[in-house]
């Protein structure tokens, strides 16, 4: 008997009600191997979730989230609110990054701005909240009689170095 | 099967009250911290509160602080959003959902919506 369930193909289910027959999948359930007691029940993308592909017989939906949210774990499990870009998500909605802090990106957290001088740099272009410092040449490298091909460009951004 | 229910909608005067109400079945709902979000006619979805597991920490949208309240009873498996002080700009479609697993430890992240409830604020 084993081996007639074995012969169902995906998109069916082994149907122990009519003598092992092989029957298709209910509508919004599937099967995406051969040999299966039961369908899955589709997952559906609803709320927050917008489908990306649509369930057949042989494989689930995918979801994908909506504008101004994007995927968080396998299978685009979750959907994490999008902030702009020089915020972070907190427990109180989208905030400010910190003076010092930047993100670049809808999502994650602010991080500091890089040290130039741990690096023997100085600050090219101040950092903002959007946008992390550039750093430059060393001090000594500009210093009096140094060999330098161009001079330090002026900070061409509001903001200020994290020194 | 894992569900929210909304309940609690309809239409109300400026200055009015409404409460909201999200019965949840087919999970352990005391595990998750639960969130209220909602759609305005023709605008984007909008978080509005979330409230921790056991109720210990409630965050609000900044234009609803002071004047929504979020709330749980676990014992009956639901979330509450009592909204006082209602404006025209609170109209939308009111939406409850489940934070995933390592919701506000490591991300905001929500798995599991409503089908939603419509608040109309209107005289």
């Known amino acids: 008997l084993q081996d007639l369930c074995s012969n169902c193909p995906a998109g069916t289910f082994c149907d122990n009600n009519r003598s092992q027959i092989c029957s298709p999948c209910p509508p919004n359930s599937f099967s995406s191997a051969g040999g299966q007691r039961t369908c899955d029940i589709c997952r559906q993308c609803k709320g927050v979730f917008k489908t990306r592909k649509e369930c057949s017989s042989t494989s689930n939906a995918e979801c994908d989230c909506i504008s101004g949210y994007h995927c968080l774990g396998a299978e685009c499990s979750m959907c994490e609110q999008d902030c702009k870009q020089g915020q972070e998500l907190t427990k109180k909605g989208c905030k400010d990054c910190c003076f010092g802090t930047f993100n670049d990106q809808k999502r994650g957290i602010c991080r500091p701005w890089t040290n130039c001088s741990l690096d023997g740099k100085s600050v090219l272009v101040n950092g903002t909240k959007e946008r992390d410092v550039v750093c430059g040449p060393s001090p000594a490298d500009l210093s009096p009689g140094a060999s330098s091909a161009t001079p330090p460009a002026p900070a061409r951004e509001p903001g200020h170095s994290p020194q | 099967e894992v569900q929210l229910v909304e309940s609690g909608g309809g239409l109300v005067q400026p200055g009015g009250s409404l409460r909201l109400s999200c019965a949840a079945s087919g999970f352990t709902f005391s595990s998750h911290w639960m969130t209220w979000f909602r759609q305005a006619p023709g605008k984007g979805l909008e978080w509005v509160a979330h409230i921790k597991e056991d109720g210990s920490e409630k965050y609000y949208e900044d234009s609803v602080e002071g004047r929504f309240t979020v709330s749980r009873d676990n014992a009956k498996n639901s979330v509450y959003l009592q909204m006082n002080s209602l404006r025209a700009e609170d109209t939308a479609v009111y939406y409850c959902?489940?934070?995933?697993?390592?919701?506000?430890?490591?991300?905001?992240?929500?798995?599991?919506w409503g089908q939603g409830t419509t608040v109309t604020v209107s005289s």
């Open positions: 959902a489940r934070g995933g697993d390592g919701y506000s430890d490591s991300h905001f992240g929500v798995d599991v």
